[in-house]
């Protein structure tokens, strides 16, 4: 019995087609992805093949102005229109709190939303009961398939799930649910979830009875043969894991941002054993036309976004200096504002011993593309922020050793004075440079804000200690020459859309007046 699994993950609000790098579409003839194009391909496969499931492995939320404005209603509407069969909860589905998940998505979705390792307690338990499920048995042709969901247990550090949701260990939570499916005579089981490729592989290895793992969170690109675009494969598609009980379990993921549609064909025998698995992600490029009815619907929803861009978010009573003459040479108050917003967006009081789990921010000065003049009545709009942060990136959470941070700050000034973009703006860090010294030895003082303290204060950076840092995804991926970050990071979790982080902060503060205050000397 042959099953076709179509899958997406980490779409992050890319409802409209995007450029090849998943930023805003400029030249339509070269654009990719988007729900209208996705629907065309999905329908084509549904017509051609008998047993098809369309699955999403989480993180539909967060990433463009679509989410900022529609807050998840757009996800429910367009996933319903595409007739998704199931979705796993990702960490970003909690970005607007539990209410921001329940009302727009859980109550509106016409497909099951799954996670076996999230347990509700207290008053939330009855409120959320039945709105998401640990598993769902889906009829597919003559057969039935069990889908069991899972979500990163790091979600409390990455998003805002509140205090009434407990995130359990994925493997511990999945096994009893899979066992339950087996007792219901369901012998074809897909684990669909959002914990990253390493955990996907562990689930394939450790959870008895799981036949296929469809994952997300790590934006992993897998491909067999010559890849069709710029993404470099982390392995073959599907990636085969040998389970502890000796079965070959295919593991798949489909990069991110709706650029690809994962396409996996599985042949099962009567016992539910995977006899064969093959496929590849399908690049959703302009050779696939956008479905006209979905496209018309997108255009209708688009109108509200254009109106939103020009509305006031808050006010500034000082000039926000985002000029390259400042931000690439010295501390600039636009850099301070953005870093403060980045830390504020990551306030998670999950442990009494820590005032927060992260205190540090770094930001490449070259990523700040425009100032904002306060003489326009102080008004700040989304449009203004889009000029400052035009690249559509995210502000991510990484874990780095002190020694890596030291290298990063040396790199920041290794060719100081040439107006290059790698000069770092900071938050929760005091750095002192001596530019008379030779490159690679210019950082003379590097103090960082403590987290395990009730009164935050600055302590010298320890080379062997592991620190959490918020930074742009551009830096996490080694951009502007920060190869040491990419090579040496110990953990990387993608965060919220850059403009959204700053806009939320400005809306929260109402009036802002960031200063240059001696963070960089």
């Amino acid at each position: 019995w042959e099953l076709t699994i179509l899958h997406t993950n980490d779409v992050h609000s890319r409802l409209e087609q995007t450029s090849e790098d998943s930023s805003k579409c400029v030249n339509a003839s070269r654009c990719m992805g988007g729900v209208a194009r996705l629907f065309t391909k999905v329908q084509q496969i549904r017509r051609a093949e008998p047993n098809v499931l369309l699955l999403d492995a989480g993180d539909q939320y967060q990433g463009t102005i679509w989410f900022t404005v529609y807050k998840g209603a757009e996800v429910a509407h367009f996933m319903n229109a595409l007739r998704y069969d199931a979705m796993a909860l990702g960490n970003h589905e909690f970005d607007n709190g539990v209410e921001g998940l329940i009302e727009p998505l859980l109550k509106e979705a016409k497909f099951p939303i799954l996670s076996a390792n999230i347990k509700a307690k207290g008053p939330l338990a009855s409120q959320i009961s039945g709105l998401y499920l640990p598993y769902k048995v889906l009829p597919v042709g003559d057969e039935v398939v069990g889908i069991v969901g899972y979500t990163s247990k790091e979600t409390p550090f990455l998003s805002n799930p509140g205090t009434n949701l407990v995130f359990e260990d994925e493997i511990t939570a999945l096994q009893p649910e899979v066992d339950k499916l087996k007792t219901l005579n369901v012998n074809k089981i897909i684990a669909l979830g959002h914990s990253g490729f390493e955990m996907d592989k562990l689930i394939a290895q450790k959870v008895r009875g799981v036949d296929v793992v469809v994952g997300g969170h790590s934006n992993t690109f897998l491909y067999t043969g010559n890849p069709p675009s710029k993404e470099v494969p982390a392995g073959k598609y599907p990636f085969i894991v040998t389970s502890d009980d000796g079965r070959k379990v295919p593991v798949v993921q489909a990069y991110a941002f709706g650029k690809y549609l994962g396409y996996l064909k599985i042949e099962f025998d009567e016992r539910g054993n995977v006899i064969s698995s093959h496929g590849n992600p399908i690049l959703l490029n302009s050779s696939i036309p956008e479905d006209p009815s979905i496209k018309a619907d997108i255009n209708k929803w688009r109108i509200k976004l254009d109106n939103y861009s020009t509305q006031e978010l808050g006010k500034t009573i000082v000039y926000l200096d985002g000029s390259s003459q400042s931000c690439r040479f010295r501390e600039c108050n636009m850099g301070n504002l953005i870093c403060d917003a980045m830390i504020n967006n990551n306030l998670r009081h999950t442990d009494e011993m820590f005032w927060n789990h992260v205190s540090m921010c770094i930001l490449n000065g070259g990523g700040i593309r425009s100032p904002i003049d306060e003489r326009n009545n102080g008004t700040i709009t989304w449009e203004n922020l889009a000029a400052v942060l035009p690249f559509g990136g995210t502000f991510d959470l990484v874990q780095l050793k002190g020694s890596t941070l030291k290298k990063a700050f040396e790199h920041s000034v290794h060719r100081y004075g040439q107006s290059t973009g790698e000069f770092l703006q900071v938050g929760g860090i005091h750095v002192v440079y001596d530019l008379s010294r030779k490159p690679g030895d210019r950082v003379v003082k590097l103090d960082v804000l403590c987290t395990k303290c009730r009164v935050p204060s600055y302590d010298p950076l320890k080379m062997d200690e592991v620190y959490k840092v918020i930074l742009p995804n551009f830096l996490a991926n080694g951009g502007d020459g920060f190869q040491m970050i990419k090579d040496e990071l110990l953990r990387h979790d993608s965060g919220d859309q850059d403009i959204n982080v700053v806009s939320t902060y400005i809306s929260k503060m109402k009036v802002i007046y960031p200063a240059v205050e001696g963070r960089i000397k």
Epitope: W1, G141, E143, T242, D269, E270, N273, V274, S276
Partner: antibody, heavy 114, light 107 residues
Framework: EVQLVQSGAEVKKPGASVKVSCKAS????????MNWVMQAPGQGLEWIGR????????FYSQKFKGRATLTVDKSTSTVYMELSSLRSEDTAVYYC???????WGQGTTVTVSS | DIQMTQSPSSLSASVGDRVTITCRAS??????LNWLQQKPGKAPKRLIY???SLDSGVPSRFSGSGSGTEYTLTISSLQPEDFATYYC?????????FGGGTKVEIK
């Protein structure tokens, strides 16, 4: 649990035909195939052919094409193998086996003797 | 048709021995290969499917490996109940074909 139950032993004369049945249970019958395999006394296994339960599509080994006929009765989840123009070398145990031979019937002994 | 050449056709071994059986296909069969065990007077039983996946209930001393045209069944430590005849089966293309079998006997 998958179960395949075959009909009993048969003794046939050369030139006659035999029809062996295989009743399946414990799985969604219409979604799969059934294989038939022959094993002559003291010999190895030989694949005869397969039938798709849902639409009756068949595929035969060249050796058995024209003499073996596979049919299906969806209402009773039963598959049949008829072998015609029997000769002494057709004396064997005939097995039905699921799609990828994960489960087997108990075997039906067919003896061809004058 | 794809020919499956199985070797050896028989072998004698003692309890605890490591036993290796090989199947060579006349052309590339991907990993579309099963290993079966048959005891006298009984129907065959599948041990391994898709080259290396172990059927449920099959002891972990059995393992399969290979790719392309060369495939191996290994019994890491032979047990008394393992004395039987073993067959490979390719299902890469019709007609499916079995190897000639390997009879594992007590030394």
């Amino acid at each position: 649990e998958v179960q395949l139950v075959q009909s009993g032993a048969e003794v046939k004369k050369p030139g006659a035909s035999v029809k062996v049945s295989c009743k399946a249970s414990g799985y969604t019958f219409t979604a799969y195939f059934m294989n038939w395999v022959m094993q002559a006394p003291g010999q190895g296994l030989e694949w005869i052919g397969r039938i798709y339960h849902n639409n009756g599509d068949t595929f035969y080994s060249q050796k058995f094409k024209g003499r073996a006929t596979l049919t299906v009765d969806k209402s009773t989840s039963t598959v049949y193998m008829e072998l015609s123009s029997l000769r002494s070398e057709d004396t064997a145990v005939y097995y039905c086996a699921t799609s990828y031979v994960g489960d087997w019937g108990q075997g039906t002994t067919v003896t061809v003797s004058s | 048709d794809i020919q499956m050449t199985q070797s050896p056709s028989s072998l004698s071994a003692s309890v605890g021995d490591r036993v290796t059986i090989t199947c060579r296909a006349s052309q590339d069969i991907g990993d579309s290969l099963n290993w079966l065990q048959q005891k006298p007077g009984k129907a065959p039983k599948r041990l391994i499917y898709a080259t290396s996946s172990l059927d449920s209930g099959v002891p972990s001393r059995f393992s399969g490996s290979g790719s392309g045209t060369e495939y191996t069944l290994t019994i890491s430590s032979l047990q008394p109940e393992d004395f039987a005849t073993y067959y490979c089966l390719q299902y890469a293309s019709f007609p499916w074909t079995f190897g000639g079998g390997t009879k594992v006997e007590i030394k």
